[in-house]
């Protein structure tokens, strides 16, 4: 899905006033310093390409991350204000919620939704310089 | 069972407000998005705005913003409308409608009416 | 943000088919495959009959079929029956500026 016509600042702000709080709260525990930012991106299209990837692909080591809050409502949010958010994309996404059976907060998961924190940050800031 | 229930008919005069109740039930009320679609007599159906408890985001048509006030209360299942300024084009049965879990604008399920009447 | 445009009648015998029509623009019906179909009986709520432009919720007969073509979407009901006869509402999404419009609707009379 191409993510360039989506609506930004609405965006932002769902994140803002809700989806932040969720990453928070996973989180909860672990040092801010624990992990290591290697995921980035140049822009916002760009950020909600690797925001939705990280989200909703299984990885090694972390399967679960679609049935977590911050991934509902980030899917809700994309829903609503990317116009044409491909109904295969959320398909896709429903289909992988409804085939874990359980919540495991691994390590790896950790380590990914501080990933995801990172993009979310970065999709905040869009006219800072990639460092 | 899954349903939409809506509380009861009103009548209401020019240049007051009306507040009109919707209780979801059987499902879960937050994932959906609750909209507000009016159909004046005879005529065709309206769109006036839309509430995703999920996500608390609330979006109105252009016709209706700052006239339209749509909330929900995730304890009791509960999505409301407000109208202000209430004019007699108002005259509408009002519906609430349940959009489809992030598919907001297919409305698979529909409250049974509540007639608004504005007269003076 | 004018509504879709819909002939405002149309009708058919028992047994035969019918299309209904609903006309909007590249911003709404032909932008996105976010058309949904909507049957109304006197006095009652509408009912979800096709949705994403072709498919059918459970319970819907599979007399009802919607397409899309361009910037015009159709349903088609064949096998036309008595209970048919209501009022038929096409709706599409158009983009996070307007985000809904309905058409003025079609009334279906069975002959």
């Known amino acids: 899905y191409d993510f360039t016509n989506c609506d930004f600042e609405k965006i932002k702000a769902a994140y803002l006033s809700t989806i932040s709080k969720d990453l928070i709260t996973y989180m909860s525990g672990t040092k801010s310093t624990e992990f290591n930012n290697t995921v980035s991106c140049s822009n916002r299209p760009h950020c909600l390409t690797e925001i939705q990837s990280l989200t909703f692909n299984p990885t090694a080591g972390c399967a679960s991350l679609a049935k977590e809050m911050f991934a509902m409502k980030t899917k809700a949010a994309l829903a609503i204000w990317c116009p044409g958010y491909s109904e295969t994309q959320i398909n896709a996404t429903q289909a992988m919620k409804k085939a874990r059976k359980s919540k495991v907060t691994t390590n790896k998961c950790l380590e990914q939704v501080s990933q995801l924190q990172g993009l979310w940050r970065r999709f905040n800031r869009p006219l800072l310089k990639q460092q | 069972q899954v349903q939409l229930v809506q509380s009861g008919a009103e009548v209401k005069k020019p240049g007051s407000s009306v507040k009109v109740s919707c209780k979801a039930s059987?499902?879960?009320?937050?994932?959906?998005?609750i909209s507000w679609v009016r159909q004046a007599p005879g005529q065709g159906l309206e769109w006036l705005g839309v509430?995703?408890?999920?996500?608390?985001?609330?979006i109105y048509a252009e016709k209706f913003q700052g006239r339209v006030t749509i909330t929900a209360d995730t304890s009791t299942s509960t999505a409301y409308m407000e109208l202000s300024s209430l004019r007699s084009e108002d005259t509408a049965v009002y519906y609430c409608?349940?959009?489809?879990?992030?598919?907001?604008?297919?409305?698979?399920?529909w409250g049974q009416g509540t007639l608004v009447t504005v007269s003076s | 943000q004018s509504a879709l445009t819909q002939p405002p009648s149309a009708s058919g015998s028992p047994g035969q088919s019918v299309t209904i029509s609903c006309t909007g623009t590249?911003?709404?019906?032909?932008?996105?495959?976010?058309v949904s179909w909507y049957q109304q009986h006197p006095g009652k709520a509408p009912k979800l009959m096709i949705y994403?432009?072709?498919k059918r919720p459970s319970g819907v007969p599979d007399r009802f079929s919607g397409s899309k073509s361009g910037n015009t979407a159709s349903l088609t009901v064949s096998g036309l029956q008595a209970e048919d006869e209501a009022d038929y509402y096409c709706?599409?999404?158009?983009?996070?500026?307007?985000?809904?419009?309905f058409g003025g609707g079609t009334k279906l009379t069975v002959l």
């Open positions: 059987g499902f879960t009320f937050g994932s959906y998005g």
């Open positions: 590249s911003s709404d019906i032909g932008g996105y495959n976010r």
């Open positions: 509430i995703v408890p999920l996500v608390g985001v609330t």
């Open positions: 409608a349940r959009g489809q879990e992030y598919f907001y604008w297919y409305f698979d399920l």
């Open positions: 709706s599409s999404y158009a983009g996070t500026d307007i985000f809904v419009l």
């Open positions: 994403e432009f072709n």
